[in-house]
């Protein structure tokens, strides 16, 4: 079947990186500079994508594959093939389908990417909350109340955080 097809259509013999040149008796010609063909049998080569402005080149264009872009620092890609760049979220936020949203009470994110995670539940380890959690920071667990027996060194309670939160007990 392949042989029959190639007899009928000489273009089917043209590999990726070439195009079937109608102006030259359907000879397979290499893609011109800044163009590519990722499949065989193509009658034209596609123009390479240029990564400009907020987009930077992740992978150079070759005769058989398009360039790939990503976003400059402080931004991340959106869409198939990084068609848009979106600003990274702030600490204390997470990226949702609708963009950056503040972490819900009881959760935190100490990075500019990723999702909000629940505060540590100190009581599960038999400990108490030493420092309250915020949108940007997890709670800090301290020794359990039993560890603070009479005569043991006492822990001075910390000054309240700017955005006081409480570990879910």
């Amino acid at each position: 079947f392949e042989r029959t097809r190639s007899l009928q259509d000489p273009c089917s013999n043209c590999p990726a990186g070439t195009f079937c040149d109608n102006n030259r008796n359907q000879i397979c010609s290499p893609c011109p500079p800044n163009s590519f063909s990722s499949a065989g049998g193509q009658r034209t080569c596609d123009i390479c994508r240029q990564c400009k402005g907020v987009f930077r080149t992740r992978k150079e264009c070759s005769s058989t594959s398009n360039a790939e872009c990503d976003c400059t620092p402080g931004f991340h890609c959106l869409g198939a093939g990084c068609s848009m760049c979106e600003q990274d979220c702030k600490q204390g936020q997470e990226l949702t389908k609708k963009g950056c949203k503040d972490c819900c009470f009881g959760t935190f994110n100490d990075q500019k990417r990723g999702i909000c995670r629940p505060w540590t539940n100190c009581s599960l380890d038999g400990k108490s909350v030493l420092v309250n959690g915020t949108k940007e920071r997890d709670v800090v667990c301290g020794p359990s109340p039993a560890d603070l027996s009479p005569g043991a060194s006492s822990v001075t309670p910390p000054a309240p955080a700017r955005e006081p939160g409480h570990s879910p007990q």
Epitope: G53, V54, L78, G79
Partner: antibody
Amino acid sequence: QVQLVQSGAEVVKPGASVKLSCKASGYTFAGFEMHWIRQAPGQGLGWIGAIDPKTGGTDYNQKFKDRATLTADTSISTAYMELSRLRSDDTAVYYCTRDLGYFDVWGQGTLVTVSS
Amino acid sequence: DIQMTQSPSSLSASVGDRVTITCRASQDIRSNLNWYQQKPGGAVKLLIYYTSRLHSGVPSRFSGSGSGTDYTLTISSLQPEDFATYFCQQSEKLPRTFGGGTKVEIR
């Protein structure tokens, strides 16, 4: 904050040229493409072209390719659009806007009136 | 060029109404669709990008949806400051193209 401030209104004669400016502040000017868009009175928005200030590389709408020239001066964070051989139907508000794959910040617009 | 057809071209609504504006592309634009608001003074603001992502500072009553060639902007409860003209725009291919606009007027 990120801001684009455009030059003032212009009244020009048919056949003449006009050069508009768009000064950026609050971000790294060279790091983002600048696009130019126009709106004729009572009409929609039409894309003119874009410039990458870092390289000076440009893309133009075929409709404006032979009359529009986009340039940028990174030393003063300013983009320019020059439109030549003006006609009465070039009367419009011209906007510059920053590109992220979407236009997140727009200039206030410059009204160009072409009249004899 | 990719043609963007917006409907309706104008609509009358009251404060509190739910308003829906549609935008159809002449080919698949793979969610690369943005919405803008233009107030009578001429100022243009980004509302929604990449079909459904709300730009910072935009009230949550605005939402976007769609895929392929068909996209929608919804205002869940129209407020007095929402009376304006709305444009869709595709970023799939150059030249960037806009819909013809939808003017939202007070009934």
